[in-house]
Every structure is written in structure tokens, then in C-alpha cells.
Amino acid sequence: GSERTCCPVNWVEHERSCYWFSRSGKAWADADNYCRLEDAHLVVVTSWEEQKFVQHHIGPVNTWMGLHDQNGPWKWVDGTDYETGFKNWRPEQPDDWYGHGLGGGEDCAHFTDDGRWNDDVCQRPYRWVCETELDKASQEPPLL
């Protein structure tokens, strides 16, 4: 594929990445799949400025990001190292709370109304943010 040099229509560019902000809600897995079909991934937050950029665009609304611990340890969907990377959890989070009565704990991370992160039940229909890097090769065939 060709290298993407500008963001698709309705996506927002920031620091060599493109972001798309949903206005509807989906379960985490459906949101993850949506982004993959767009040749992107759920947003991976790697810095304070990226955190603030996303926060600025989503407002005080619960919104999925590309972080989960469904297979044990916390993992970013693009392979970014969780342990050494940026984190912005709310105090006392993540807590893998079982008291919600929906079965299981809480395995998916989202931005809360103040921008800080919480783990929640992956089936909750939250908004989501897709991200794709401008410099990566696009899956679209090059224009002739």
C-alpha cells in the first residue's frame, strides 16, 4: 500500500496521527472492530499532550480507548508497552470491580468525565476514538 500523507475526511490530525471521534456508543469489541475496518485502532495514549488533545475533543463523556486486560495484563492494542508508558488512571483505578452484577470484572479502559481513566465492563456502549498514524502504509491501493 501507499504511505498516508494526510488524514481522511472527518478525521482530525494531531502530531502525525489522525483521530476519529464517534458520536454514538458501542461495546469495546465492536468499537475495536470498527477502527480496524477503518485501517486504524482504538486510540493509544502515549503522552500528556495526546491525553489533553483527546480530552479536549471528547468532552466530559465516557469514551473507550485501546487499552484492555482481557487476557491478564493490561495491553495497548498497538503493542505499545503498558508498564513503561503513560498512564492516567483515576485514583483507586483500575479496580476490576465485580459488584456491577453484569458478570465478570472490568477489563476495558475508558476516559471518564474528567479525562482520567477507569476500567469498566467491556459490554457497555460507550463512545470511542480511532487513531491511525500518518506515516504508516495504507491498505488502500495506490492511485494510478
Epitope: S47, E49, Q55, P60, F86, K87, N88, W89, P91, D114
Partner: antibody, heavy 123, light 107 residues
Framework: QVQLVESGGGVVQPGRSLRLSCAAS????????MHWVRQAPGRGLEWVAV????????YYADSVKGRFTISRDNSKNTLYLEMNSLRVEDTAVYYC?????????FGYGMDVWGQGTTVTVSS | DIQMTQSPSSLSASVGDRVTITCRAS??????LGWYQLKPGKAPKRLIY???SLQSGVPSRFSGSGSGPEFTLTISSLQPEDFATYYC?????????FGPGTKVDIK
């Protein structure tokens, strides 16, 4: 009222260590990002380090990286700056400051500062 | 790292004067900029946050404007207690950086 009080400053020889403390009161310390900032004699303000509310992120100015360590004890409402391998150029007034949390929103910079504690590095 | 330049480095003014201080960032910082007042032996005091919002308790003669790389602090009518050194601070990304300061003294 919201208050930050620094302590631990003093005169120290180059190469030695010192630990500064910042006692917080009047707010929920564990919910706030905290900073250290310094001002050398006759110079401007210089940001030194920051620590997240839970200690999960720490960032440092290049001038102190590898020598200074920022930490906190939320049970004691206290912020620390461990300063090792001190240099003459570390001589300054050291301030602790709170990152604003306003209307459930972060990212407005430092809103509350302490009065500062003086560190003098001299042989 | 983001560099902050500030002008003028010092100025002499009289009570009642209108004073303008400019700060410029080496790259875009959105509106992640604050203005601080520093007096000897006292804690720094924030005057303006988010480039143009007045800190609670700060007199309305202080105002901030600008976005992107260039920002301005204006004191509409200088008062005796305003003689101090003023710093801008970018808190867009780490390391945070201050401008070199502007000393405002009595003419």
C-alpha cells in the same frame, strides 16, 4: 485553606545529597498532579519535575534527569524531591506547585504554589 | 523541547500606564499557557490560565490574549502593587518551560 509548605533546604557541598519536602493541606492531595519548580539567584523560573497523583508518571527537566527523584506519600500528604550529586548550579529557591484540577478538567497548569525553600550548593 | 521567548526583558512604567508583555512559543501550544507574577520572597501567583482566563481573585486590569505561538499579557492601568517580574509558562508538553521573564519597575 489550600496550602503548600516546603522544607528541607540548606547549605550542602557539591556532590552531596538533600531531600526536600512539601506538606500539602486544605485539599485532597492524592487527586492532584504535583510539580517542583526552582529559581536560581538572578535567574528566571525553571520547571524541575512532575509526578502524577498515584506516582504512575514522572517527568524531569534534562538538567536534573538521573540526579533528582520526585516522589510522594499520599498517606502523609507530602511531596518529595530527592537531590543527589548536587552541583553549584542547583543553587536555587525550590517551589512545589499543584497542577490545577478545575471543574473535573486537567491541563490548566500550576495554580497553587508554596513559598519556597532555599538550597545552596557551595564548597 | 518547546522554547519560550518573552519581550521586553524589562520595562519602566508609571502608575496608570498600560503595559503589554508578549510571549512566543517555538511551536504550537494551543492555549496551554499561563501568566505568573513573582515578587521577591513570595510565592509565585498565577494571573491568567488557558491563555485568556482570569484567575479567581486577580484584578480585572490583568488580561491575556493570543493562541498558537504568540500570547500577550496586558495590565490596563498599572498599580503600585504590580511592580514585579512576570513569566509565561507553557504547559502543553513536558518539559514545561517558562519564558525568561519581564521585570516591570517604576519609571
Amino acid at each position: 485553606q489550600v496550602q503548600l509548605v516546603e522544607s528541607g533546604g540548606g547549605v550542602v557541598q557539591p556532590g552531596r545529597s538533600l531531600r526536600l519536602s512539601c506538606a500539602a493541606s486544605g485539599f485532597t492531595f492524592s487527586s492532584f498532579i504535583m510539580h517542583w519548580v526552582r529559581q536560581a539567584p538572578g535567574r528566571g523560573l525553571e520547571w524541575v519535575a512532575v509526578i502524577w497523583y498515584d506516582g504512575s508518571n514522572k517527568y524531569y527537566a534534562d538538567s536534573v534527569k538521573g540526579r533528582f527523584t520526585i516522589s510522594r506519600d499520599n498517606s502523609k500528604n507530602t511531596l518529595y524531591l530527592e537531590m543527589n550529586s548536587l552541583r553549584v548550579e542547583d543553587t536555587a529557591v525550590y517551589y512545589c506547585a499543584r497542577e490545577e484540577y478545575s471543574s473535573g478538567w486537567f491541563g490548566y497548569g500550576m495554580d497553587v504554589w508554596g513559598q519556597g525553600t532555599t538550597v545552596t550548593v557551595s564548597s | 523541547d518547546i522554547q519560550m521567548t518573552q519581550s521586553p526583558s524589562s520595562l519602566s512604567a508609571s502608575v496608570g500606564d498600560r503595559v503589554t508583555i508578549t510571549c512566543r512559543a517555538s511551536q504550537g501550544i494551543r492555549n496551554d499557557l499561563g501568566w505568573y507574577q513573582l515578587k521577591p520572597g513570595k510565592a509565585p501567583k498565577r494571573l491568567i490560565y488557558a491563555a485568556s482566563s482570569l484567575q479567581s481573585g486577580v484584578p480585572s486590569r490583568f488580561s491575556g490574549s493570543g493562541s498558537g505561538p504568540e500570547f500577550t499579557l496586558t495590565i490596563s492601568s498599572l498599580q503600585p502593587e504590580d511592580f514585579a517580574t512576570y513569566y509565561c509558562l507553557q504547559h502543553y508538553s513536558f518539559p514545561f518551560t517558562f519564558g525568561p521573564g519581564t521585570k516591570v519597575d517604576i519609571k
